[in-house]
Interface confidence: medium
């Protein structure tokens, strides 16, 4: 067989669909691998071929497009299931070819079961809402292309297991769900069930997403350095371990990169010769504000180390801050016992 550009198994596009529901799956070649679309390919005389490998099998086989009621069909660059069955799970390949050109890619399709409360192994998209920020909406995702605009589906929204009706601050508005004022108590899984008719049959589309209420940009502040601070002095004798934590609070900011770093005498620890280790830990509040701690450690501090400047720096989209730690050498206490003993003429 002639050479075919094989893009392999595209695990980045692990597709999950619910059992017994319609699914439309676009060939990933045109979305992610090729620089032209299906229409261009079709008009250039290229043909799109589909085949699949069943779960736990090695054999590639053609897809049966002659099932009753056209359960599986292809339309342009889309593979349709009306509806899916559990044993449709497998790796699907779409191949674009003519006598001189060939390109193909495979992708995994998993058909998953859900219970009556919409729980399933499905990976859920997360939608972030700002706390106490005014009206915000989520939209029932991935339902475009399933029915024509002339069809008016019915949409029912659920929070967890419960149908959303007469909720205080959550109002269903067709494909949208409006949150009048988002609160921590609105965290959870929200499901829309879209019901539509097609050729005398009724189909259901179930879409679940996770709502996470996060800190509002109205409340966002530049990073706050809790430690080091003016109340704490790191007073050490040479040979002792020096531990200085830098603990920084970051307000939640969408797509902000939070950074914490130490400088010693104005240089990054990697750029100096002293034996420094830095350990980092991160924790989050319920609204995804972040507290980062970087502990600077010098196992056996020298008197030279105790004269250096240790500065903790932090940066977010809201600004940059820095704070120096107060480090000093401990003054040895006078040895009163010996001096007093001598003074009293002890032998």
């Amino acid at each position: 067989s002639e050479r075919c550009d094989d893009w392999g198994l595209d695990t980045m596009r692990q597709i999950q669909v619910f059992e017994d529901e319609p699914a439309r799956i676009k060939c990933p070649l045109f979305e992610h691998f090729l620089k032209f679309n299906y229409s261009t390919a079709h008009s250039a005389g290229l043909t799109l071929i589909w085949y699949w490998t069943r779960q736990d099998r090695d054999l590639e086989e053609p897809i049966n497009f002659r099932l009753p009621e056209n359960r599986i069909s292809k339309e342009k660059d889309v593979l349709w299931f009306r509806p899916t069955l559990l044993n449709d799970t497998g790796n699907y390949t779409c191949m674009l070819r003519n006598t001189t050109y060939c390109s193909k890619v495979a992708f995994p399709l998993e058909v998953v079961q859900k219970d009556s409360c919409f729980n399933s192994p499905m990976k859920l998209p997360v939608h972030k809402l700002y706390i106490e920020y005014g009206i915000q909406r989520i939209t029932c995702p991935n339902v475009d292309g399933y029915f024509p605009s002339s069809v008016k589906p019915t949409i029912t929204w659920y929070m967890g297991c419960y149908k959303i009706q007469n909720f205080n601050n959550v109002i269903p508005e067709g494909m949208n769900l409006s949150f009048l004022i988002a609160l921590i108590s609105n965290n959870g899984n929200y499901t829309c069930v879209v019901t539509y008719p097609e050729n005398g049959r009724t189909f259901h589309l179930t879409r679940t997403l996770t709502v996470k209420v996060v800190g509002s940009p109205k409340n966002a502040v530049p990073p706050v350095i809790h430690s080091p601070n003016d109340h704490v002095v790191y007073e050490k004798e040479p040979g002792e371990e020096l531990l200085i934590p830098c603990t920084v609070y970051f307000s939640f900011l969408m797509d902000s990169r939070n950074e914490v770093w130490w400088t010693i005498d104005g240089k990054k620890p990697d750029d100096i010769t002293i034996d420094v280790t830095i350990n980092e830990s991160i924790s989050h509040s319920r609204t995804e504000d972040e507290t980062r701690t970087q502990i600077l450690s010098i196992k056996k501090v020298t008197s030279e180390d105790l004269k250096r400047s240790y500065v903790c720096h932090a940066r977010s989209a809201k600004g940059e801050v820095a704070k120096a730690a107060k480090v000093k050498q401990k003054v040895p206490a006078p040895r009163y016992t010996v001096e007093l003993a001598c003074g009293f003429g002890a032998t």
Epitope: V221, S227, H231, P245, Y249
Partner: antibody
Framework: HVQLQQSGPELVRPGASVKLSCKAS????????MNWVKQRPGQGLEWVGQ????????YYNELFEGKATLTVDTSSNTAYMHLTSLTSEDSAVYYC????????????????WGQGTSLTVSS | DIQLTQSPSSLSASVGDRATITCRAS??????????MHWYQQKPGKAPKLLIK???DLESGVPSRFSGSGSGTDFTLTISSVQPEDFATYYC??????????FGQGTKLEIK
């Protein structure tokens, strides 16, 4: 999860001294202030002092200066309070309590508490 | 030092009642954006438990019937509908500035 486990009850003679312990787990011990709070039977809460484990920096309620000494052992994540020259007035339950971290620069609340150690000073 | 005065020192309520405890500081414990006033609940033989921090922030896991308000020198803890498990002693606590923290003298909430 955060836990503060305090040492067991103590019965000591007047004039003696005692060292109470508070073992922390479930968080980065050196990065949070550790406080000690006294509660006499049937009375309210009285702040004794606090220590920052990373540096050993301490602050005391002036009423307990010379009475209480706060120390830590960072290798075992344990805070200690040493009480000296004990009298019946020192009989109380002593709690260790961690300060939280919050967005604000200072003024922390006591978010986790040990179960308390009962100290009885009696001859 | 800042003194805290709680009132009343004891309060009788029935299940379902609304209960209000106030705490007055001898000087302001607020600055721009927050107040260093916190509320704790203590049951006999148990350690205090943080309910409200920074005057109005409900601590994680605390029922929403508890709420806090106030700024400057006057603060309030409110239980909107007292439940059987709420009968306990309540303390206000300020942590304004280092190095001195103080507590109110406590308010005992009793069954009527």
């Amino acid at each position: 999860h955060v836990q503060l486990q305090q040492s067991g009850p103590e019965l000591v003679r007047p004039g003696a001294s005692v060292k109470l312990s508070c073992k922390a787990s479930g968080y980065i011990f050196i990065t949070y202030w550790m406080n000690w709070v006294k509660q006499r039977p049937g009375q309210g809460l009285e702040w004794v002092g606090q220590i920052f484990p990373a540096s050993g920096t301490t602050y005391y309620n002036e009423l307990f200066e010379g009475k209480a000494t706060l120390t830590v052992d960072t290798s075992s994540n344990t805070a200690y309070m040493h009480l000296t020259s004990l009298t019946s007035e020192d009989s109380a339950v002593y709690y260790c309590a961690r300060t939280d971290f919050y967005r604000y620069d200072g003024g922390y609340a006591l978010d986790y508490w040990g179960q308390g150690t009962s100290l009885t000073v009696s001859s | 030092d800042i003194q805290l005065t709680q009132s009343p020192s004891s309060l009788s309520a029935s299940v379902g009642d609304r209960a209000t405890i106030t705490c007055r500081a001898s000087q302001s414990v607020s600055t721009s954006g927050y107040s260093s006033m916190h509320w704790y609940q203590q049951k006999p033989g148990k350690a205090p438990k943080l309910l409200i921090k920074y005057a109005s922030d409900l601590e994680s896991g605390v029922p929403s019937r508890f709420s806090g308000s106030g700024s400057g020198t006057d603060f309030t803890l409110t239980i909107s509908s007292v439940q059987p498990e709420d009968f306990a002693t309540y303390y206000c606590h300020h942590s304004w500035g280092i190095p001195m923290y103080t507590f109110g003298q406590g308010t005992k909430l009793e069954i009527k």
